[in-house]
């Protein structure tokens, strides 16, 4: 933005500048150009020897300017366009200035003036240029500063040129008031802080309903000496409940919301929320729908899931595999987990109680993501009821629970766990174990073994203890071994078939 302090052309000859010597040299003339009157200060004493003609402006109030720009529009006539030339003719003039705190009026003293520059035309008007208004207009600009006094004068010294001064415009530059990144920057005088710091740093203020983002930098701009804004730093963002519309922050419309200061527009209220009012920062959930603490406000409100589907309990000796499928209604969430609880009942007394402490789960039963789990260490001749509950992120916000139950009766003991204790070239020492709670029900253990690959014959040994040594075996041979508990009711669950190998005659024991 240019703030004009003096504009000769705009004043239509009314300024009345001082000429020195009075009545000689510079002369105010009116001409017609393109049917319009134009005023100019002109001098053409090219045949009059050495010249020292001064033209001084009126006193110009400096206002806030620190450096001023002087734009001159002028015409200089070619010295060769005069008959026979003109020996004392020049084609330049000098520009001066003087600062003062008061207007000296007609008191003109050359010594108070400081030379700014010699003004030379880029183009001179030669005689062939006179046709069709082809008068070469030169534009020159000079900068002066820093200024410190209340005002100043400019002066033009003619040293024998044929020159017409058509326009003298003096202005200073301001960076205009500006809205940028939702920040308002005030009109600022364009001034260099120093030679090394040619930019003035200006802090902006956020527009209504805009804020500096948390942890962010406040808005700053740099005003150059040329009156241009440069290098924006930081920004303002529309606060919660408001969105950016052009250079302002506007309240979110009803049915929309914005939860935080951001560049984002207002969002439509998500599913299962009540319509918001103007300027809403969130949308309330419908009755029966909830938001988990970690749910973003842009997410639909959700509800707890329904119970798992198709729960089955498959007994395998003293183990049960529980399987189920996901709930029909997830409540609109993906974060479903399952909890398994266990209850055991004694058939004789009908007495029941929790059994979490006495059974073992294949994985922790309270945050299952898969839809199956194996429960082991179940006691024979006991009735078990398993409840599988489906939960999601909002289940904790309601008291009701969504679960399905399955019951199973355990008749068999759990299969023994078998291991090889020792071996030699002709023998294998085998031990096993079963849960302590089931041991009282076992009458004997039956050990079946045979050579691997020999499907036609096998041997059986019975014992009441938890170990047996199988003798008269062939060296370096693999045997298939299985242990089965025998109860009063018949055979219990058999162990899996193990492969054990005797030592070779070259090998030593172990």
């Amino acid at each position: 933005k240019e703030v004009v302090l003096l504009d000769f052309a705009a004043m239509k000859g009314e300024l009345g500048w001082l000429t020195h010597p009075y009545g000689k040299g510079w002369d105010l003339m009116q001409n017609i150009m393109d049917d319009m009157p134009i005023y100019m200060y002109s001098v053409c004493n090219v045949v009059s020897g050495d010249q020292d003609n001064w033209l001084r402006t009126n006193w110009v109030y400096r206002e806030e300017a620190e450096r001023i720009f002087i734009e001159l529009k002028f015409t200089v006539r070619d010295c060769n366009s005069f008959p026979g030339g003109a020996s004392s003719c020049k084609e330049t003039f000098n520009l001066y200035y003087a600062e003062s705190d008061v207007d000296y009026g007609t008191n003109f003293q050359k010594r108070q003036f400081t030379k700014i520059d010699t003004i030379a035309p880029d183009e001179i008007t030669v005689s062939s240029d006179f046709e069709a208004r082809n008068v070469k207009l030169n534009v020159e600009e000079r900068m002066v500063g820093p200024l410190t006094r209340k005002g100043f004068y400019l002066a033009f010294q003619d040293i024998g040129a044929c020159v017409a001064l058509l326009s003298v415009r003096v202005y200073y530059k301001k960076c205009p008031e500006m809205l940028q990144s939702l920040a308002r920057f005030p009109e600022t005088i364009a001034v260099a802080v120093s030679d090394t710091q040619p930019l003035a740093t200006v802090a902006g203020t956020c527009v209504d309903h805009a804020v500096v983002p948390y942890g962010g930098e406040g808005p700053l701009m740099h005003c150059t000496v040329d009156g241009e804004w440069l290098v924006p730093i930081g920004q303002c963002l529309c606060q919660e409940g408001y969105e950016k519309v052009e250079d302002a922050c506007r309240a979110c419309s009803p049915g929309f919301f914005k939860s935080e200061a951001s560049e984002s527009p207002c969002l439509e209220c998500p599913e299962h929320t009540l319509p918001s009012t103007e300027g809403a920062t969130s949308c309330q959930c419908e009755e029966g729908y909830f938001r988990a603490p970690e749910d973003p406000l842009s997410m639909s409100c959700t509800r707890p899931p329904s119970a798992p589907n198709y729960l089955t309990a498959i007994g395998m000796g003293a183990k049960v595999e529980l399987r189920w499928t996901a709930p029909k209604d997830t409540g609109g969430r993906q974060d479903i987990v399952y909890s398994v609880t266990c209850e055991q009942c004694w058939p004789e007394s009908g007495e029941c109680g929790p059994c979490e402490a006495s059974v073992r789960y294949s994985e922790p039963p309270h945050a299952l993501t898969r839809t199956s789990v194996t429960v082991s260490d179940l006691e024979p001749h006991m009735n078990y009821t398993f409840a599988v509950e489906a939960r999601n992120g909002v289940s904790g916000l309601v008291t009701s629970r969504s679960f399905r139950t399955a019951s199973v009766s355990i008749n068999q003991t759990e299969p023994p766990k078998v291991r090889l204790e020792d071996r030699s070239t002709t023998s294998l020492s085998v031990t096993w174990s079963i849960p302590v709670s089931q041991q009282s029900r076992v009458w004997k253990y039956e050990v079946t073994y045979r050579k691997k690959g020999d499907a036609n014959s096998y041997n059986v040994r019975r014992t009441e203890g938890f170990s047996v040594t199988l003798d008269d075996l062939a060296p370096d041979t693999t045997y298939l071994v299985q242990v089965q508990a025998l109860t009063q009711e018949g055979q219990g669950a058999g162990s899996k078939v193990h492969e054990f190998q005797t030592l070779s005659t070259e090998g030593s024991a172990n």
């Epitope: 017609i32 006179f130 069709a132």
Partner: antibody
């Protein structure tokens, strides 16, 4: 006020010389060039040239070189036109005129009353 | 040398009428040549010079225009004192006059 004063009519014989004075008043004589213009009886104007009153340097138009001389006496603010070897066709009114120079063009803004020079045997 | 041709040689007008005088150059010359008025027995008088600048004391019914080779002096409403001979003059390194146009009472 600004004035250019010329001498009265002159009658000369062919081959003779004449010196026509032009005395300036009302302004600084050396600040403006002086032109000379000839007007033959019943004819139009002819520009003869000018003299730089500051340096005394003359400029002659085509057809006015040789017999025509412009000169000055700045002490009495007077310009002179001297014509030698007069011919019958030199019979005319001779005007001095102050030159007005501007960036946008030139003119002669103050004229003497003219001096009639008659060349006749 | 540039030749200036003025037309018409004689222009008959009644007082109060508009008079238009033409000045044509043999080649492009200075814009808006100078114009002079000469009455019988008198020295010429400068009317207009430069960019159509009227000389001191010249009434505004006199105006000049034109460019290149064709120039015009216009007297918007001829007054009795305007009947005279009018000359155009081009400037530059050499000056020349037109042969003149006589404005007479119709």
């Amino acid at each position: 006020q600004v004035q250019l004063l010329q001498s009265g009519a002159e009658v000369k014989k062919p081959g003779a010389s004449v010196k026509v004075p032009c005395k300036a008043s009302g302004y600084t004589f050396t600040s403006r060039a002086m032109s000379w213009v000839r007007q033959a009886p019943g004819q139009g104007l002819e520009w003869m040239g000018w003299i730089n009153t500051n340096t005394g340097n003359p400029t002659y138009a085509q057809g006015f070189t040789g017999r025509f001389v412009f000169s000055l006496d700045t002490s009495v603010s007077t310009a002179y036109l001297q014509i030698s070897s007069l011919k019958a066709e030199d019979t005319a009114v001779y005007y001095c005129a102050r030159v007005r120079l501007t960036v946008y063009g030139d003119g002669m803004d103050v004229w003497g009353q003219g001096t009639l020079v008659t060349v006749s045997s | 040398e540039i030749v200036l041709t003025q037309s018409p040689a004689t222009l008959s007008v009644s007082p109060g009428e508009r008079a238009t005088l033409s000045c044509r150059a043999s080649q492009s010359v200075s814009s808006n040549p100078a114009w002079y008025q000469q009455k019988p027995g008198q020295a010429p008088r400068l009317l207009i010079y430069g960019l159509s600048t009227r000389a001191t004391g010249i009434p505004d019914r006199f105006s000049a225009s034109g460019s290149g080779t064709d120039f015009t002096l216009t007297i918007s409403r001829v007054e009795p004192e305007d009947f005279a001979v009018y000359y155009c003059q081009q400037y530059g390194p050499s000056w020349t006059f037109g042969q003149g146009t006589k404005v007479e009472i119709k």
